[in-house]
């Protein structure tokens, strides 16, 4: 048993039929010695008396909020949560496996630049009685500070018969130098509590590997005289690290017909303009990627040819 | 990656072209190592990230863009003790910090060159003949060092009398390539920045 936060405890259980469970001793937080009784949740039935209560925790029915009282007055609470281990593996019932970029990916994180700010998100089909808390650090043995906000519900989607809920959190490394070469990864730890079930999820990454620039901005077309060609121009996104001559981007320009089956013309360039042939009903899209370290491409910025 | 190969303008900062070739060569070598050594811990997640230049050079700090010198987090260990000479410097624009920066890059390349050559000598003794260092990568390191043209004592190649442990050597190769790729990215950013200024 260990303390998750004040008055909230996690009991780690091997989960198999007829498992013996864990013997837990709860101590009433009071200087009083006599006349103490214990109850569970909203029930008034006395489970035991004395300053300590010993319980055998085997399943969720044994978890909950234990309260010690004296003479009708509440002295203290202890909320017991369960963390299940099945076949040596901690349960992952609360979050959905996003399967990207690999199986057992429950947390996904992205950064728009090298400032040390990043966003992580996760998915669940659970809609109520759900709380998350997020901690992060750079490295684990001698951790350096990363500050995370509160996790918030950021999107709801319908997937077949199920509703899917996306939660996200923003974190910022306390003292980040955009030009630094990372040797220790960022560690992100999410505690998830659904009703009386506790689970934890972790992710470890370098900012450089989760970079995904915002799409290029101010995408414009300038027709060239007596030609089907147009000059496409764009700018670096505002959120990208500066100076741009140090944190350079490379770009992919794509001409796409109305039909998805039509052949796409693609040009790669380090410049912020390109000359392409604009077909009728086609659209021109541009996306960006770090020029020197191949992490993710940005989403496309698009304009119609007409 | 399907990108056009940049061909430098004649008046271009002379080291930019070499640094781009360096990044391409080390990235290719790292990819080859990951594929060839697929049953070894050779991915970014699996290896320990070691920097052989730590406490010996300070390329990131010495080469910091002017715009980032206001960032306290970037200034924790500025070094100011490098040789100041080198042909990449367009003389009028030469600044003390720029000289420190380029000499720090030179020292990095020299250190990696020695490590890679020593390692290659060991890998050539491996009866499995599983992987060797790409001669192109070694040549590109050499070219960039020549372009930087700093006078510096030659470091003798390390020789080892004991029988090489090929498994450990291959793990070390992965660690070295990952670290060198990160440094090559920094070098490319620096050259791009100097070229623009």
């Amino acid at each position: 048993i260990w303390e998750l936060k004040k008055d909230v405890y996690v009991v780690e259980l091997d989960w198999y039929p007829d498992a013996p469970g864990e013997m837990v001793v709860l101590t009433c937080d009071t200087p009083e010695e006599d006349g103490i009784t214990w109850t569970l949740d909203q029930s008034s039935e006395v489970l035991g008396s004395g300053k300590t209560l010993t319980i055998q925790v085997k399943e969720f029915g044994d978890a909950g909020q234990y309260t010690c009282h004296k003479g009708g007055e509440v002295l203290s609470h202890s909320l017991l949560l369960l963390h299940k281990k099945e076949d040596g593996i901690w349960s992952t019932d609360i979050l959905k496996d996003q399967k990207e970029p690999k199986n057992k990916t429950f947390l996904r994180c992205e950064a728009k630049n090298y400032s040390g700010r990043f966003t992580c998100w996760w998915l669940t089909t659970i809609s109520t009685d759900l709380t998350f808390s997020v901690k992060s650090s750079r490295g684990s043995s001698d951790p350096q500070g990363v500050t995370c906000g509160a996790a918030t519900l950021s999107a709801e989607r319908v997937r077949g018969d199920n509703k899917e809920y996306e939660y996200s959190v923003e974190c910022q490394e306390d003292s980040a130098c955009p030009a630094a070469e990372e040797s220790l990864p960022i560690e992100v730890m999410v505690d998830a509590v659904h009703k009386l079930k506790y689970e934890n999820y972790t992710s470890s990454f370098f900012i450089r590997d989760i970079i995904k620039p915002d799409p290029p901005k101010n995408l414009q077309l300038k027709p060239l005289k007596n030609s089907r060609q147009v000059e496409v121009s764009w700018e670096y996104p505002d959120t990208w690290s500066t100076p741009h001559s140090y944190f350079s981007l490379t770009f992919c320009v794509q001409v796409q017909g109305k039909s998805k089956r039509e052949k796409k013309d693609r040009v790669f360039t380090d410049k912020t303009s390109a000359t392409v042939i604009c077909r009728k009903n086609a659209s021109i899209s541009v996306r960006a990627q770090d020029r020197y370290y191949s992490s993710s491409w940005s989403e496309w910025a698009s304009v119609p040819c007409s | 990656r399907n990108l056009p190969v940049a061909t430098p303008d004649p008046g271009m900062f002379p080291c930019l072209h070499h640094s781009q070739n360096l990044l391409r060569a080390v990235s290719n070598m790292l990819q080859k190592a990951r594929q060839t050594l697929e049953f070894y811990p050779c991915t970014s997640e699996e290896i320990d990230h070691e920097d052989i230049t730590k406490d010996k050079t300070s390329t990131v700090e010495a080469c910091l863009p002017l715009e980032l010198t206001k960032n306290e987090s970037c200034l924790n260990s500025r070094e100011t003790s490098f040789i100041t000479n080198g042909s990449c410097l367009a003389s009028r624009k030469t600044s003390f910090m720029m000289a420190l920066c380029l000499s720090s890059i030179y020292e990095d390349l020299k250190m990696y060159q020695v490590e890679f050559k020593t390692m290659n000598a060991k890998l050539l003794m491996d009866p499995k003949r599983q992987i060797f260092l790409d001669q192109n990568m070694l040549a590109v390191i050499d070219e960039l060092m020549q372009a930087l043209n700093f006078n510096s004592e030659t470091v003798p190649q390390k020789s080892s009398l004991e029988e090489p442990d090929f498994y450990k050597t291959k793990i070390k190769l992965c660690i070295l390539l990952h670290a060198f790729r990160i440094r090559a990215v920094t070098i490319d950013r620096v050259m791009s920045y100097l070229n623009a200024s």
């Epitope: 949740d41 039935e45 489970l47 969720f60 009703k195 | -």
Partner: nanobody
Framework: EVQLVESGGELVQAGGSLRLSCAAS????????MAWYRQAPGKQRERVAT???????DYADSAKDRFTISRDNAKNTVSLQMNNLKPEDTAVYYC????????????????WGQGTQVTVSS
């Protein structure tokens, strides 16, 4: 709908024995403590015995050495074996259980049975 149904109450002679049973049915997620209470005419309801989910019993002074509480978690039942009954044990005996239901599946609430009459004649 959750129901607690007591059975086994009847008229018995002093010194005799009775076994009361209580079965919880309906939508039940889990049961914590189960207990027997009694209320004699003109008196307040008082606790007789409690048994925790883990099977630990606790008795009121009046029930010690004479009464035994037991439960079957698989069947959601609780029993009270009463021996050496006295006229002062005459009362309506109520079963009480702390239940979690699908609507309150992580909070125990108290539920009561309707009671069963035990009369001990001298």
């Amino acid at each position: 709908e959750v129901q607690l149904v007591e059975s086994g109450g009847e008229l018995v002679q002093a010194g005799g024995s009775l076994r009361l049973s209580c079965a919880a049915s309906g939508s039940i997620v889990s049961i914590s403590a189960m207990a027997w209470y009694r209320q004699a005419p003109g008196k307040q309801r008082e606790r007789v015995a409690t048994i925790t989910r883990g099977g630990t019993p606790d008795y009121a002074d009046s029930a010690k050495d004479r009464f035994t509480i037991s439960r079957d978690n698989a069947k959601n039942t609780v029993s009270l074996q009463m021996n050496n009954l006295k006229p002062e044990d005459t009362a309506v005996y109520y079963c009480k259980a702390a239940l979690r239901t699908p609507t309150h599946d992580y909070n125990y609430y108290d539920y009561w049975g309707q009671g069963t009459q035990v009369t001990v004649s001298s």
